[in-house]
């Protein structure tokens, strides 16, 4: 890093002072400072001397010495104040150009650091700064307007308080240029349009930019449309709007419409599709199967997609039976709009009860008529089992009734000892009944089956168990013969609560 002699960060000198600044480095060194008169520069090898025999206020500034060959790019600096009571300001530039949201440095350098406490920034002719102008001051560099705005493009003066009066610098013109971040921003409304032949339609294409220099046009199937343009300026943006009004649409108006805007940064375009139909339409569909099976106690959401034009005049969910005459609670019905012509309607059925199985219908109406979509909801139940001892045709028979949905399968077990449930170690015999007799099988109800086990002689120290299972679960009933007759044991798990 080069070294400046004298080795102080800043100095205050009199006008007319002789100033010699010497910079020494390992290699060749270079001076950089404000453009000002009277300086002479001479170098010898690794040192460079900046000298004046008659310093003026214009020599006020920061003098930086760099070593071009230094890979670390180190530098040293000294700030010189030439304290001139008649000239409190040294203005290094009378025009400053920045882009919006950059910091704008107005380079009026104070010639006497003592004056720092009384400095201010004003607009020319003593006008105050615009509201929300956020600025700071450095005696070495001047005033910085932070995050400059286009509207702050003004002529400014730096003011210093000297002996009770304000002394102004020459004016500095600030030009804040709008940043054009890219092509203009676009909106094309509506994003989709459907009309019946003969109806009116409107398509609006608008573009905006921070700069006025941009073009916008609307095209239909690659044909540019001649539409008068409306221009406006608000929120610090220029806007250009093209409005296509169609009094009576016909099929030739249908197709793709593109809104295109361009400036020096490039081009943006956005498209929409206009559909012209002969008459009103209303289509109902669902991504779900219309036949639903759900385990009792669980929940289900039924969803219907609606495509319609014109908009719906009415819609509702209806329970068509077969159990109670209850209707779905409105709070469980929900409607969401995907876009202008497509909607999703959801019916939430939480913790389903046996009486809620059946048909659910979504009905919708628009000028095109009524449409309905019906779901069939069947509830699944684990089997419930009961066993009785009876005589059929004079033969002793164990009769097992199992009821559930889907239809239960039945298995008989004979095991040693008296038990509520046969375990593997106790099992003596197993009989599967592949075709139990179906006693009842109505839609939306449980299926009840019956299985018969003919037993010639009941073994008294044994247990006969009927087991039923389906995809939901299983149930069983243990039959224990006793000398005085038969005794049955339903297991604990039979006590099922949905």
């Amino acid at each position: 890093i080069p070294v400046i002699e004298p080795s102080v960060p800043e100095l205050v000198v009199k006008p007319g002072a002789t100033v010699t600044l010497r910079c020494v480095g390992n290699g060749s060194v270079e001076w950089d400072g404000p453009p000002s008169p009277h300086w002479t520069l001479y170098s010898d090898g690794s040192s460079s001397i900046l000298s004046t025999n008659n310093a003026t206020f214009q020599n006020t500034g920061t003098y930086r010495c760099t070593e071009p060959g230094d890979p670390l790019g180190g530098s040293a600096a000294i700030h010189l104040y030439v304290k001139d009571p008649a000239r409190p300001w040294n203005v290094l530039a009378q025009e400053v150009v920045v882009f919006e949201d950059q910091d704008a440095l107005l380079p009026c350098l104070l010639t006497d650091p003592v004056l720092e406490a009384g400095v201010s920034l004003v607009r020319v002719r003593g006008r105050p700064l615009m509201r929300h102008t956020n600025y700071s001051f450095s005696p070495w560099h001047g005033f910085t307007i932070h995050r400059a705005k286009f509207i702050q493009s003004q002529d400014y003066q730096c003011s210093a308080l000297m002996g009770g009066r304000k002394v102004m610098s020459i004016s500095i013109r600030l030009k804040v240029q709008k940043v054009i971040p890219g092509p203009p921003a676009l909106t094309l409304v509506p994003a989709e349009l459907v009309r019946i032949r003969g109806e009116a339609a409107q398509i609006v294409c608008s573009a905006s930019s921070v700069d006025v220099n941009f073009d916008v046009f609307l095209q239909h199937n690659n044909t540019k449309l001649a539409i008068p343009q409306q221009s406006d300026f608000h929120n610090n943006r220029y806007q250009k709007v093209l409005t296509l009004n169609l009094d009576q649409v016909d099929f030739q108006h249908a197709g793709n419409y593109s809104c295109v805007a361009s400036n020096v940064q490039g081009k943006h375009s956005t498209s929409m599709f206009f559909r012209v139909v002969e008459s009103a339409y209303l289509n109902l569909s669902s991504e779900q199967n219309l036949i639903q099976e759900v385990t009792v106690g669980e929940g289900l959401n039924l969803k219907v997609m609606v495509e319609a034009y014109p908009g719906l005049q009415g819609f509702n969910w209806t329970y068509l039976g077969p159990f109670s005459d209850h209707q779905p609670e409105p709070k469980l019905a929900n409607a969401t709009t995907k876009d202008t012509y497509r909607h999703t309607f959801t019916l939430s059925l939480p913790r389903l009860k046996p009486s809620e199985a059946g048909r659910y219908s979504f009905l919708a109406r628009n000028p095109g008529g009524w449409r309905a979509l019906t779901f069939e909801l069947t509830l699944r139940y684990p089997p419930e089992v009961s066993v009785i001892w009876t005589f059929i045709n004079g033969s002793g028979t164990l009769l097992c009734a199992a009821s559930g949905y889907p239809q239960p399968n039945v298995t008989w077990l004979q095991c040693s000892g008296h038990t509520d449930r046969c375990d593997e170690a106790q099992v003596l015999q197993v009989w599967d009944d592949p075709y139990p007799e179906v006693l009842s099988q109505e839609p939306f109800h449980k299926v009840t089956v019956q299985s018969l086990l003919t037993v010639e002689t009941l073994e008294h120290n044994q247990t006969y168990e009927c087991r039923a299972h389906n995809s939901v679960g299983s149930g069983s009933w243990a039959f224990i013969p006793i000398s005085a007759g038969a005794h049955t044991h339903p297991p604990d798990e039979f006590l099922f609560t949905p």
Partner: antibody
Framework: QVQLQESGPGLVKPSETLSLTCTVT????????WSWIRQPAGKGLEWIGR???????NYNPSLKSRVTMSVDTSKNHFSLKLSSVTAADTAVYYC???????????????????WGQGTMVTVSS | DIQMTQSPSTLSASVGDRVTITCRAS??????LAWYQRKPGKAPKLLIY???TLESGVPSRFSGSGSGTEFTLTISSLQPDDFATYYC????????FGQGTKVEIK
């Protein structure tokens, strides 16, 4: 408007250390050199020494062994200590701001554009 | 040390007079000389620096000249406010002052 004000005891015993402080008001102490100058009764002005805001100092060779100067930028003041005083150190002591007229690699020199009112220090037992 | 010698030590003059004070340096000090005015009970006031440059706010009746070892302060037309003691000061090598010249009313 920058003003300087000297403060310190008006009476110091021989062989003791004279301590004075100069307070700067109306502006920052930064960027300048600050000097102490004295004038014994019936004699001329004598420059004692100077200090820059960074703390670097230059002293009058004839007083160098006895002089210590310091600066406190946070309090905006600078100080003088003169040790082993004798009756010959009896004088009016001024603090002054120096503004440079010559700046060179090896030295800087200037004139005193702002002075304090001065404070009388008597060395006596 | 560079010695500074002022002459005369005392100067009697009347309002309107042209007054000249001389200052000699024991060795060459180029143009590194200043002149101060001091009134009783007040701090010295800078008049001229770099031998001939008038300090801001100082009346133009004051002027300075010289280089090397011989320097002069001239008051072209003495005013009542000018009766005071004047000091020269060199800043070529450290800082030394002349012993002062008192300008009094004749």
């Amino acid at each position: 408007q920058v003003q300087l004000q000297e403060s310190g005891p008006g009476l110091v015993k021989p062989s003791e250390t004279l301590s004075l402080t100069c307070t700067v008001t109306g502006g920052s102490i930064s960027s300048y050199y600050w000097s102490w100058i004295r004038q014994p009764a019936g004699k001329g002005l004598e420059w004692i020494g100077r200090i820059y805001t960074s703390g670097s100092t230059n002293y009058n060779p004839s007083l160098k062994s006895r002089v210590t100067m310091s600066v406190d930028t946070s309090k905006n003041h600078f100080s003088l200590k003169l040790s082993s005083v004798t009756a010959a150190d009896t004088a009016v002591y001024y603090c002054a701001r120096e503004i440079l007229v010559v700046v060179a690699a090896t030295r800087t020199g200037g004139v005193f554009d702002i002075w304090g009112q001065g404070t009388m220090v008597t060395v006596s037992s | 040390d560079i010695q500074m010698t002022q002459s005369p030590s005392t100067l009697s003059a009347s309002v309107g007079d042209r007054v000249t004070i001389t200052c000699r340096a024991s060795q060459s000090i180029s143009s590194w000389l200043a002149w101060y005015q001091r009134k009783p009970g007040k701090a010295p006031k800078l008049l001229i620096y770099k031998a001939s440059t008038l300090e801001s706010g100082v009346p133009s009746r004051f002027s300075g000249s010289g280089s090397g070892t011989e320097f002069t302060l001239t008051i072209s037309s003495l005013q009542p406010d000018d009766f005071a003691t004047y000091y020269c000061q060199q800043f070529n090598s450290y800082w030394t002052f002349g012993q002062g010249t008192k300008v009094e009313i004749k």
